[in-house]
Interface confidence: low
């Protein structure tokens, strides 16, 4: 029988009455157009909803938008369109919500053709009040908040000017012209690329990378011949054109661009690309596209300086620049990532790593599933996960994989069981141990979300017909109850719950259609009465993450340490609560060769933990570029994995000597850099 339909499933007592008392309908007085929803702040209960409706007239498009505000997690909404003077808001800029709990909101308005500049509406009190501000420029991008100070905003204009505000959008100053891309760094630093001749497109590969640390008072050119740049963790990356041909290479800086090193990565040609898949303060996952229109490339993982890279995964699916990749960080368990590879026969297969890219394996076949038509051997196959690529290909996959840092070990995803991803209708699978084991959770495609730090999982069937039923589980997807939240089915458009998965409220969005009109409607369900009591100590159990062999003393050791978590028992029906903090107990492991990556000039043969010298470098001095100087490396082939905390045990020797010579291959040497002040 399907999960949730057997006798073992204990039913939640009187749940229909409890949920009926906590189901709140709101019908929006709108013609159906588009709707966007934003949460303002954390645990504030404030939601802003913007509805827009376009009427295409013969000579122009007439637009109308309405703004609604809720301060009770979506149970009730108030029309606050008059606070923005009934102005039509541009949906392509969305609602720019300030970082943390600043309570700041910026809405960008549509203005008539001949106006001198754009118009914004600003709120700094969680959208209770708005101030209208006319801009001295037409914005090209959404206002970007400095992560360190929400009063500092930057925006690019349609004429490629870089504009900065120091007083939350009240006053604006153009600090530079001819800007292609701008990003906030740390400490209110702004990085941006500029063009000298024609345009961003024409100068691609001849751009300059600039930095200002004082909001435009002074500038420093930190790179030339730039194609593009990116920030990840504590790393600043730039792809730089080679002197002699059309190839480009990645350079990396860990000091905001003062000094650069060339990353030991392959160079790429005009049609190829680099992509930072994930980065933290320890390391980076970098995708390097394969030559030709193959749709795949190679994942490399960096050392702690972002310079030396180890090949992590071949034939990694990534369709085109800015295209689709299935690379997913499983945030519910440290070190776990899932992605897809394109195999030789053109089929797509899912791979998982539990040690931050050290080794990749197939996902274990769920015990309650059979291998499908893609499997050569009906008894041996794997789970394959549908993610961004499947969604882009219009497969019947309504949602990407889901995991939450505070719902430890839980991963939910659509998938199929075979030798490759199948085009057939997928089912929903769940893992409760960070991807080591999987179970079929629901038949067919569903929308799903996690509430109360994993205490409740909610799902709605993906259907082209109107729906009025929601499913929920209080035991991590083993057993399911169904609740009819309305008598009149609605055309479902989305599930919304507060980011962070701490809430116990879920909003079901959709529209009703009658003979002449259609209207937006939301149903917000509060599950607080289903989880009647607060969880106590007895409701939690100790769980060792990454445990595969309890007999082994090193069981659970990943990146040099193991972690024990307190996790809610599946049988406990209680509230983790909004203030729930994940309780974990780390313990350090002894070092083994698994705790080291292969150093520059070395590689790991398949299924071997030893690093061996690359044949082409045997007997050569190992010299490489570091901070614009040439370094000589004395090594026996190992370098500690970034973030690895192991102690004792195996301890390979390495030493780096400064050769006191300049690198000729480094295009970003400090001599080429200059400073200027406004």
């Amino acid at each position: 029988s399907a999960p949730g339909e057997d006798e073992e499933c204990g039913r939640v007592r009187d749940f229909v009455a409890k949920l009926a008392n906590n189901t709140h309908q709101h019908v929006f007085d709108d013609l159906r157009g588009s709707v966007s929803l934003s949460w303002v702040g954390d645990s504030t209960g404030v939601i802003l909803v913007l509805t827009t409706f376009h009427v295409p007239l013969v000579i122009m498009t007439f637009g109308q938008s309405k703004l609604y505000r809720s301060e009770d997690y979506g149970k009730n909404f108030k029309d606050i369109t008059d606070l923005i003077n009934n102005t039509f808001i541009r949906t392509e800029f969305g609602m720019a919500i300030g970082p943390e709990n600043s309570g700041k909101v910026v809405l960008t308005a549509e203005v008539s053709g001949g106006s001198r500049g754009g118009r914004i509406f600003r709120s700094s009190d969680f959208a209770k009040n708005f101030v209208q501000t006319d801009l001295p420029f037409h914005p090209l991008t959404q206002m970007m908040y400095s992560p360190q100070n929400s009063d500092y905003l930057l925006a690019l204009s349609t004429e490629n000017g870089l504009w900065v505000s120091k007083n939350f959008g009240g006053k604006w100053e153009e600090i530079h012209k001819a800007v292609c891309l701008a990003k906030w760094g740390s400490d209110n630093t702004i990085f941006f690329t500029t063009y000298a001749n024609g345009s961003c497109k024409a100068d691609l590969g001849a751009l300059e990378l600039w930095r200002t640390s004082d909001l435009g008072k002074s500038f420093k050119t930190i790179g030339v011949k730039i194609y593009s740049f990116g920030l990840g963790g504590r790393f600043l990356f730039a792809s730089v054109m080679a002197d002699k041909d059309t190839t480009r290479r990645i350079h990396v800086s860990t000091d905001q661009g003062d000094t650069w090193s060339m990353a030991q990565l392959p160079s790429v040609g005009q049609e190829q690309f680099y992509s930072i898949l994930a980065a933290n303060d320890d390391m980076v996952f970098m995708h390097v596209d394969e030559p030709g229109d193959t749709g795949f490339g190679t994942i490399f993982t960096s050392d702690d300086r972002g310079i030396v890279y180890s090949k992590s995964l071949d034939r990694h699916l990534y369709t085109t620049t800015g295209g689709e990749t299935d690379f997913t960080n499983v945030t519910s368990l440290r070190g776990v990532y899932i992605t897809s590879v394109l195999s030789e026969d053109n089929s797509i297969q899912t791979m998982i790593t539990f040690d931050q890219g050290g080794r990749w394996t197939h996902l274990r076949k769920p015990e309650n599933s059979e291998c499908d038509a893609t499997a050569k051997n009906k008894n041996e196959c794997s789970l394959h996960i549908h993610a961004s690529y499947s969604i882009s290909q219009k497969l019947n996959v309504p949602m990407a994989p889901l995991s939450e840092p505070n719902a430890v070990g839980i991963v939910i995803a659509h998938g199929s069981v075979g030798d490759a991803i199948s085009v057939m209708v997928p089912d929903v699978y769940i893992s409760d141990d960070g991807g080591y084991s999987w179970t079929k959770m629901l038949e067919g495609p569903h929308y799903y979300t996690i509430l109360d730090s994993g205490g409740i999982i909610v799902a709605i069937e993906h259907s082209s017909r109107p729906i009025n039923v929601i499913k929920f589980s209080t035991d991590e997807g083993q057993c399911w109850q169904t609740y009819t939240f309305t008598r009149d089915p609605i055309y479902f458009t989305g599930l919304a719950s507060e980011p962070g998965a701490r809430s116990m409220n879920i909003s079901i969005w959709g529209f009703t259609e009658s003979f002449l009109t259609s209207q937006w409607v939301s149903y917000t369900i509060d599950f607080k009465d289903i989880l009647e009591r607060n969880c106590e100590e007895k409701d939690y159990t100790i769980w060792l993450a990454h445990s595969t062999d309890p007999e082994d003393y090193e069981d659970g050791c990943i990146l040099g340490y193991k972690e024990q978590f307190l996790r809610l028992r599946k049988s406990s029906v209680c509230q983790n609560g909004r203030d729930y903090v994940v309780t974990k107990q780390p313990s350090i492991c002894l070092c083994s060769l698994e705790d080291f990556l292969c150093d520059f000039g070395y590689y790991r043969p398949e299924n071997d933990s030893k690093c061996v010298e690359q044949p082409e470098l045997k007997g050569h001095d190992l010299e490489f570029c570091l901070y614009g100087r040439e370094e000589h490396l004395t090594t026996n082939g190992y370098r500690k994995i970034p973030g690895d905390k192991c102690q004792g045990g195996v301890n390979p020797v390495r030493e780096v000597k400064d050769l006191k010579k300049k690198c000729t291959s480094n295009f970003l040497s400090p001599e080429k850099q200059n400073s200027k002040s406004n």
Epitope: L342, D345, N346, S347, I348, A373, T374, A375, K376, Y389, Q393, K394, L395, N396, G418, D419, A420, I421, S422, V423, M424, V425, S464
Partner: antibody, heavy 125, light 108 residues
Framework: QVQLVQSGAEVKKPGASVKVSCKAS????????ISWVRQAPGQGLEWMGS????????NYAQKLQGRVTMTTDTSTSTAYMELRSLRSDDTAVYYC??????????????????WGQGTTVTVSS | EIVLTQSPGTLSLSPGERATLSCRAS???????LAWYQQKPGQAPRLLIY???SRATGIPDRFSGSGSGTDFTLTISRLEPEDFAVYYC?????????FGGGTKVEIK
């Protein structure tokens, strides 16, 4: 050149079985699947199922499940379709077609690009 | 299952005219999984278009395919005498594979 050659016409009584063959030539048989499609007189096309010549995996239409069996013989590059418990509404022309998606999953569908000439099966008492 | 509805059922046109055939799906179909076939009386179907818009080997460029989601179109820019036949669309976007009911293009 690439071609699929099917066995000759058959006349069967209701309740009997029929087995149609489809011999492939001009390409690597195991690199593709074979799909079977039928067409009742004056009607449209109806997909019956697919088989992977690579691993023998099958995928049948729901309405024929239990009555149809598809097999391949890689030594002779031949695909077979057997239909049991024949009824009068099984009277149709039966086609085999080369199908890149048959039984295995590509991330792109290239269509059924080569077809057999068709086998007429008449079911009559 | 996904139902493919082809329209019109019959299209009466003269040689040299443009033919536009429609195939509508009951739910969204991945465009890379839609194909068009031509069938003449007494013959097996012939693949014309795969991936909604890619011409199969040997198919003249007067045949073109377009569309995405639930609406797909086969266009024959200038009808030649040999183009009068029945045309079927076919989807493999979700199981089971289904064909449309067909559009007959006949000489006016």
């Amino acid at each position: 050149q690439v071609q699929l050659v099917q066995s000759g016409a058959e006349v069967k009584k209701p309740g009997a079985s029929v087995k149609v063959s489809c011999k492939a030539s001009g390409y690597t048989f195991t690199s593709y699947g074979i799909s079977w499609v039928r067409q009742a007189p004056g009607q449209g096309l109806e997909w019956m199922g697919s088989i992977s010549a690579y691993n023998g995996n099958t995928n049948y239409a729901q309405k024929l499940q239990g009555r149809v069996t598809m097999t391949t013989d890689t030594s002779t590059s031949t695909a077979y379709m057997e239909l049991r418990s024949l009824r009068s509404d099984d009277t149709a022309v039966y086609y085999c077609a080369r199908d890149p998606s048959g039984g295995t999953t590509l991330h792109y569908y290239y269509g059924m690009d080569v077809w057999g000439q068709g086998t007429t099966v008449t079911v009559s008492s | 299952e996904i139902v493919l509805t082809q329209s019109p059922g019959t299209l009466s046109l003269s040689p040299g005219e443009r033919a536009t055939l429609s195939c509508r799906a009951s739910q969204s179909v991945r465009s890379s999984y839609l194909a068009w076939y031509q069938q003449k009386p007494g013959q097996a179907p012939r693949l014309l278009i795969y991936g909604a818009s890619s011409r199969a080997t040997g198919i003249p460029d007067r045949f073109s395919g377009s569309g995405s989601g639930t609406d797909f179109t086969l266009t024959i820019s200038r009808l030649e005498p040999e183009d009068f036949a029945v045309y079927y669309c076919d989807q493999l976007g979700s199981s089971p594979r289904t064909f449309g009911g067909g559009t007959k293009v006949e000489i006016k």
